[in-house]
């Protein structure tokens, strides 16, 4: 006869490990007992359990409550056992020693591998601002056994660097993603992908990029100069900009206070029926936590009675 077992049994942390040991005997041969022991190199054998044909299963005190026979039906030639709730410390070499009649004793060894799936974490880097050089966008760390694989999934252009730290029974892998911040990256997903044999599928953690910026400001509303004449109703100026975080707007008049009746509504400056008093230089001030921008326009309200043409100057300043 001969023993059938596995060279390696792989199990995920917390799962039950089946340690196989089957005696493939000739007709009429019987198994008297199967002794299981842990036999790591450099250490004496530590008995796990004894499976006796008459007495049943005896579990050594160190493994009490953790070793069981597989559920019935059971073949009398099957000396396999279940090691419940595998932990990392269970990883190592195991031996089954089968006493048969009349063929004598047989033994076989197997290695138990306990996979420790990682629990990845993603840490964003410092605040990203347009105009910075190469900057850390995020780092992703995963620790497991064996060492996990950490990669990035993103449309954003950048560079990655990885390092690993070996511990006694596991390894921690950290990958960093660096980029040159630009406003086009704002809102883009940056996903850390962790692969490991103990995972049914890759673990993914997504970080949404936030890049602080403030666009140049401009003022709209003076495109048709002929519309700015005395008596016109509904005239308005709109300040155009964009930024992250979203900017706030403030209107002032360079050559004096805002005329009475002029309404400020965020990025819009609304005028009452136009008079010559509304002529002047208006400044839109745009700001967020990252920067501030100004844009100024000259409003010249025309009197239709006069022949002179209307003039409008637009000036932008940063």
């Amino acid at each position: 006869g001969e023993l059938e077992t596995s060279d390696v049994v792989t199990v995920v942390l917390g799962q039950d490990a089946k340690l196989p040991c089957f005696y493939r005997g000739d007709s009429g041969e019987q198994v008297g007992q199967v002794a299981w022991a842990r036999v790591d190199a450099g250490e004496g054998a530590q008995e796990l359990a004894l499976l006796h044909s008459k007495y049943g299963l005896h579990v050594s005190p160190a493994y009490e409550g953790r070793v069981e026979q597989p559920p019935p039906p059971r073949n009398p030639l099957d000396g396999s056992v279940l090691l419940r709730n595998a932990v990392q410390a269970d990883e190592g070499e195991y031996e089954c020693r089968v006493s048969t009649f009349p063929a004598g004793s047989f033994q076989a060894r197997l290695r138990l591998r306990v996979l420790v799936p990682p629990l990845p974490s993603l840490n964003p880097g410092p605040a990203l601002e347009e105009g910075q050089g190469l900057t850390l966008a995020a780092s992703c760390t995963a620790e497991g056994s064996p060492a996990p694989s950490v990669t990035w999934d993103t449309e954003v252009k950048g560079t990655t660097s990885s390092r690993s730290f070996k511990h006694s029974r596991s390894a921690a892998v950290t990958s960093e993603f660096h980029l040159v911040p630009s406003r086009s990256m704002n809102g883009q997903p940056l996903t850390c992908v962790v692969s490991h044999p103990g995972l049914l599928q890759d673990q993914r953690i997504t970080h949404i990029l936030h890049v602080s910026f403030l666009a140049e400001a401009s003022v709209r509303g003076l495109e048709d100069q002929n519309l700015w004449h005395i008596g016109r109703e509904g005239a308005m100026l709109k300040c155009l900009s964009e930024g992250q975080p979203p900017p706030s707007y403030n209107w002032t008049r360079l050559d004096g206070p805002l005329p009475s009746g002029v309404r400020v509504d965020g990025d819009t400056l609304g005028f009452p029926p136009l008079t010559t008093e509304h002529s002047g230089i208006y400044v839109c001030h745009v700001s967020n936590e990252f920067s501030s921008r100004d844009s100024q326009v000259t409003v010249d309200v025309l009197d239709p009675q006069e022949d002179s043409g209307k003039q409008v100057d637009l000036v932008s300043a940063s």
Epitope: L50, H52, K54, Y55, G56, L57, H58, P61
Partner: antibody, heavy 122, light 107 residues
């Protein structure tokens, strides 16, 4: 025919010592582990000590640990129990018995001697 | 230590009766259980090993059953020579422990 014969019992004062012997015959003595079991007058059975086939595998009941020593001489087919610091509660018939397996669990006691009485009294 | 509890502690029966003695272990012991018979002034005698296996030379009217924590010794038809005290013993752990005994007396 397997035979186990105990000797060495008797009356001893508290604090005294006795050495019990068990002569084995009718089987290969050095192939079997051995045990001592005692029975106080009118009481049940209590396991005392065990020795495996070699002199190193020894176990004791908590009640005798540190006072009793089990040993064997395979060349003489004899099992011993050295009893020191004897107490009144050690009064019992002491039986030697053969184990069916040479290990520290999973054995039966298939042959017993006739017993020897140890009385501890002043 | 594993406690072994036998019941009843004594019973009276007549020749030909079916007698059942139970033994309960304080924790699971698989089938690591033996039954012994002891007559007054004599050494115990092994009747049943591995909970249900009959020792060589023991009459077939003796039988054992059970596994784990609950065990039974049955004498199918009590004979005059069966009046004695019966002990169960576990040898799953050290120290091996005995039940307190069941005395079978003549009714």
């Amino acid at each position: 025919e397997v035979q186990l014969v105990e000797s060495g019992g008797g009356l001893v004062q508290p604090g005294g010592s006795l050495r019990l012997s068990c002569a084995a015959s009718g089987y290969t003595f050095d192939s079997y582990a051995m045990s001592w079991v005692r029975q106080a007058p009118g009481k049940g059975l209590e396991w005392v000590s065990r020795i495996k086939t070699t002199d190193d595998g020894k176990s004791y009941a908590d009640s005798v640990k540190g006072r009793f020593t089990i040993s064997r001489d395979n060349s003489k087919n004899t099992l011993y129990l050295q009893m020191n610091s004897l107490r009144a509660e050690d009064t019992a018939v002491y039986y030697c018995a053969r184990q069916t397996e040479d290990r520290s669990y999973g054995y039966d006691l298939d042959y017993w001697g006739q017993g020897t009485l140890v009385t501890v009294s002043s | 230590d594993i406690q072994m509890t036998q019941s009843p502690s004594s019973l009276s029966a007549s020749v030909g009766d079916r007698v059942t003695i139970t033994c309960r272990a304080s924790q699971g012991i698989s089938s690591y259980l033996a039954w012994y018979q002891q007559k007054p002034g004599k050494a115990p005698k092994l009747l049943i090993y591995a909970a249900s296996s009959l020792q060589s030379g023991v009459p077939s009217r003796f039988s054992g059953s059970g596994s784990g924590t609950d065990f039974t010794l049955t004498i199918s038809s009590l004979q005059p020579e069966d009046f004695a005290t019966y002990y169960c013993q576990q040898h799953y752990t050290t120290p091996p422990t005995f039940g307190q005994g069941t005395k079978v007396e003549i009714k």
